[in-house]
């Protein structure tokens, strides 16, 4: 089961016993699969295994990416999953953990030309669930070494949105991925309806900013399913 | 100040339904994923299930599945837990977290970093 697979998942933020933000745990920790934190004048304890489903790798933090955890099983959901070390196996630059990048499936070191010249790479992307399949279309491009220590403008090459600069998002834009900005209120969106149908885009939206979310425009609710047109909106 | 606030708990026979809710207020963020987990006496708090920032990827602990329902509301800022076929061992408190982000920030490992108080839900057989 999903559980069973994930069980040794890394130790996600902890609840603080009566609400407000999680800081630190606190210094108790205990063996798993139980965590300490403390409850009023006592100690309690919260299970170790906190997935957190993700539709995109920008949902998940930096050292992680968006998959699916098992290949059969639990079709459609995805969860955030620890970043891979150099030398193993990936499918994509966002598997690779912070200064790694995708190379023929291995994650290997972004700095190993010294950041000279320019990084070949090759770019899998497939479309329909991408984590789950080395088939894809290939298409090699060239990738500016200056990302990796600058922060991206709008139009660099990315691989993930922390490359990019504030306001902007790392998106797909045909087979490679670019910083473009995130979305502004009344822009329009892209709500994802069926699980992993944000892998057909080829021309993918950044997210809506902070205080916005992706809505149907309101003029536009008695018209057909396929046709709504989503934009972002207030809360 | 951010709160949230959980509703709906209270006591129910085994076999009955119950819908959760929590209401996050306060707070300039962007809500990410939001979950539910609940404790049970003497026990590890344990997840229940969790839905993604856009609402695409759901997760269920598989003691409930095919019994329980997430589902977010983002205009009203409220994730919902819609409990049926609920048995004994369902008995414990429930609390609703979710991960606020300000706008461009990303931690190294996302995680739920705001919780509520809990409200409680005891299946009685």
């Known amino acids: 089961t999903l559980n069973s697979v994930l069980n040794s998942n890394a130790i996600k933020n902890l609840p603080p016993p009566l609400g407000g933000a999680a800081g630190h745990p606190g210094s108790a920790v205990s063996a798993a699969p139980g965590i300490l934190y403390p409850g009023g004048n006592k100690y309690q304890t919260i299970d170790n295994y906190q997935p957190y489903p993700c539709a995109e790798d920008e949902e998940c933090g930096t050292d992680e990416y968006c998959a699916s955890p098992t290949r059969g099983g639990d079709a459609g959901v995805q969860i955030c999953l620890a970043c891979r070390k150099r030398r193993k196996r990936c499918m994509r630059h966002a598997m690779c953990c912070p200064g790694n990048y995708c190379k023929n499936g291995i994650c290997v070191s972004s700095d190993q030309n010294h950041f000279r010249g320019e990084i070949e790479e090759t770019i899998t992307e497939s479309f329909g669930n991408d984590h789950s399949t080395l088939d894809g279309y290939s298409r090699r491009t060239t990738l500016s070494s200056k990302m990796y220590h600058t922060k991206g403008q709008e139009g660099s090459v990315c691989l993930r949105s922390s490359d990019c600069a504030s306001g902007l998002c790392c998106a797909r834009h045909f087979w490679s991925k670019i910083c473009k900005p995130v979305l502004k209120e009344g822009q329009v969106c892209t709500k994802h309806r069926r699980k992993g149908s944000h892998g057909l885009e080829i021309f993918q939206r950044c997210y809506c900013g902070e205080g916005l979310s992706c809505r149907i425009q309101k003029d536009h609710h008695q018209a057909s399913n396929s046709s709504r047109l989503h934009t972002c909106q207030r809360h | 100040e951010v709160q949230l606030v959980e509703s709906g708990g209270g006591l129910v026979q085994a076999g009955g339904s119950l819908r959760l809710s929590c209401v996050v207020s306060?707070?300039?963020?962007?809500?990410?994923?939001m979950g539910w987990f609940r404790q049970a006496p003497g026990k590890l708090r344990e997840i229940v299930a969790a839905i993604s920032r856009t609402g695409s990827s759901i997760y269920y602990a598989d003691s409930v599945k095919g019994r329980f329902t997430i589902s977010r509301d983002d205009a009203k800022k409220t994730v919902y837990l819609q409990m049926n076929s609920l048995k004994s061992e369902d008995t414990a408190v429930y609390y609703c977290?979710?991960?606020?982000?300000?706008?461009?920030?990303?931690?190294?490992?996302?995680?739920?970093?705001?919780w509520g108080q809990g409200t409680q839900v005891t299946v009685s057989s």
């Open positions: 306060g707070g300039t963020f962007n809500v990410y994923a």
């Open positions: 977290a979710v991960d606020g982000r300000a706008n461009g920030e990303r931690p190294a490992v996302a995680g739920y970093n705001y």
